[in-house]
Interface confidence: low
């Protein structure tokens, strides 16, 4: 064997978001014919020499980060990606509301507000059937999730959780579901918005609130699939990566510019008409990557 053995995968079934009192099984999956599996919990260090861990009744102490590896002969594999096992229902459920309304005309803005018993500084928003979550660390006891330029893809059922950054694996119960309905086209979709029309989050409007970037989120893994209680579709809790989103927007912008440059080769008259139309589109901010 040259080089380390490939890493196994570690999954929680049925979900890595586990309500207190419910059961969960962690399963480590490596290649066939493995000599030994090791499944370990980090902080505090505990391990089992088997390929699964059955937790019959989820407790606060079970929540945390897990990983696994396996041994073939004298060789150990690379460790799996870490799995975060979250205990939910530890705190009272937050409430989730949409402002100005849960029925939003396409092209308009909406803010989903997750409000919890005060002083939770982390909030997570999930959309049913989605593969990611939208996480916004914020001081105080509410979190705003602005969705700019709503599209049909934003329609759906949302739930949020709250938790304290000091106990990142102990979450609230899920909020009651909020159904976001995207209605027909906005009255003036081609209007160039002024700066005032962009939603501003509370933390940017009122600098007295503790800045949102004080909470480190570097340890959060990106590849875990989970299925919060009450929701059947698979979920994940990867962060929104704004930098990644911006990169995509830049690429889209560059593509549009290349297309515009290609138009120069065309007849002057048609180019002029086309350019006018496209420049109006460019002046509108590009919508963020769809949440769905």
């Amino acid at each position: 064997q040259s080089g380390p053995l490939p890493k196994p995968s570690l999954q929680a079934q049925p979900s890595s978001l586990v309500p207190l009192g419910q059961s969960v099984i962690l399963r480590c999956q490596g290649p066939p014919d493995v000599d030994l599996y090791r499944l370990e919990k980090l902080k505090p260090e505990k391990y089992e020499d088997q390929d699964f861990l059955f937790i019959p009744t989820m407790e606060r102490s079970n929540a945390g980060r897990y990983r696994c590896s396996y041994q073939n002969g004298s060789h150990w594999s690379l460790p799996s990606d870490q799995l975060e096992l979250i205990a939910t229902g530890v705190y009272a459920k937050p409430s989730l509301s949409a402002h100005p309304s849960s029925a939003v005309p396409q092209g308009r803005d909406v803010t989903l507000k997750c409000q919890s018993p005060y002083s939770f500084d982390e909030f997570v928003l999930y959309k049913e059937g989605d593969t990611g979550s939208y996480k916004r660390p914020e001081k105080w006891y509410r979190a705003n999730f602005p969705i700019i330029t709503v599209t049909a893809a934003h329609s759906g059922t949302y739930r949020c959780y709250s938790f304290s950054s000091s106990s990142p694996y102990l979450w609230s119960a899920p909020s009651d579901p909020l159904v976001l309905v995207v209605t027909g086209l906005s009255a003036t979709p081609s209007q160039v918005p002024t700066e005032e029309s962009f939603p501003v989050t509370e933390s940017s409007r009122r600098p007295s609130i503790l800045p949102t970037n004080k909470i480190s989120t570097t340890e959060k893994p990106m590849n875990i699939t989970a299925s919060p209680e009450g929701l059947s579709p698979p979920f994940g809790f990867a962060h929104q990566h704004y930098a990644k989103g911006n990169l995509v927007r830049i690429c889209l912008g560059a593509t549009i510019i290349i297309i515009l440059l290609g138009l120069l080769a065309e007849d002057w008259h048609s180019r002029k008409k086309c350019l006018q139309h496209r420049m109006r589109a460019l002046q509108r901010p590009l919508p963020p990557l769809p949440l769905a």
Partner: antibody, heavy 121, light 111 residues
């Protein structure tokens, strides 16, 4: 020991404002939310709002919104509650109360002695 | 009109047991933590029970709290004359973003 000491009784005319102070001692002032609760004569307790002392962030009960202002001075470990446009029904004992937890709302573990505000023409 | 509902008064003889009920809804008691306060005549309220059933240090174990669904109960055993006071329940209401209190229950110790 941990205590909250409030300013003395006030008599105000309708339409005026009153500012009540609450000085905290015996604990780290910025580590607990502070609430204001009032009690009209012979009546029950009514929550007015809270202030987060380290940032000065506030949350007011909707019925006091626009009339109440809560501030704090970290250098003197004092919180203030100002109520404007006073009416006779604002006659009450006003209490400051410390939140027992920072993580979730468990209760008010320390109370000031109360400040009687009388609104009368 | 208080958001949480308590009986206006209860009474019992010294040494007896008494319970005070507090009824709310899913947005307060049902999904949050109940606390209980004792207010002796002419004094500020004092925390008796927090987090549904926990006693702060210094509160005798004669006082107990419980919660079921959207209702909570304060129990006092071995009643003493000094227990004569007003008792209030409270909880955070996440729908209205405020603390809500019961109307208070006057406990009379007979005899």
């Amino acid at each position: 020991q941990v205590q909250l000491v409030q300013s003395g009784a006030e008599v105000k005319k309708p339409g005026a404002s009153v500012k009540v102070s609450c000085k905290a001692s015996g604990y780290t002032f910025t580590s607990h939310y502070m609430h204001w609760v009032r009690q009209a004569p012979g009546q029950g307790l009514e929550w007015m709002g809270l202030i987060e002392p380290s940032e000065g962030e506030t949350e007011y009960a909707q019925r006091f919104q626009g009339r109440v202002t809560m501030t704090r001075d970290t250098s003197t470990s004092t919180v203030y509650m100002e109520l404007s446009s006073l009416r006779s029904e604002d006659t009450a004992v006003y209490y400051c109360a410390r939140d027992s937890s920072r993580s979730y709302p468990l209760g008010f573990d320390i109370w000031g002695q109360g400040t009687l505000v009388t609104v009368s023409s | 009109q208080s958001v949480l509902t308590q009986p206006p008064s209860v009474s019992a003889a010294p040494g007896q047991k008494v319970t005070i009920s507090c009824s709310g809804s899913s947005s307060n008691i049902g999904n949050n933590y109940v606390s209980w306060y004792q207010q002796l005549p002419g004094t500020a309220p004092k925390l008796l029970i927090y987090d549904n059933n926990k006693r702060p240090s210094g509160i005798p174990d004669r006082f107990s709290g419980s919660k079921s669904g959207t209702s909570a109960t304060l129990g006092i055993t071995g009643l003493q004359t000094e227990d004569e006071a007003d008792y209030y329940c409270a909880a955070w209401d996440f729908r209205s973003s405020r603390w809500v209190f019961g109307g208070g229950t006057k406990l009379t110790v007979l005899g």
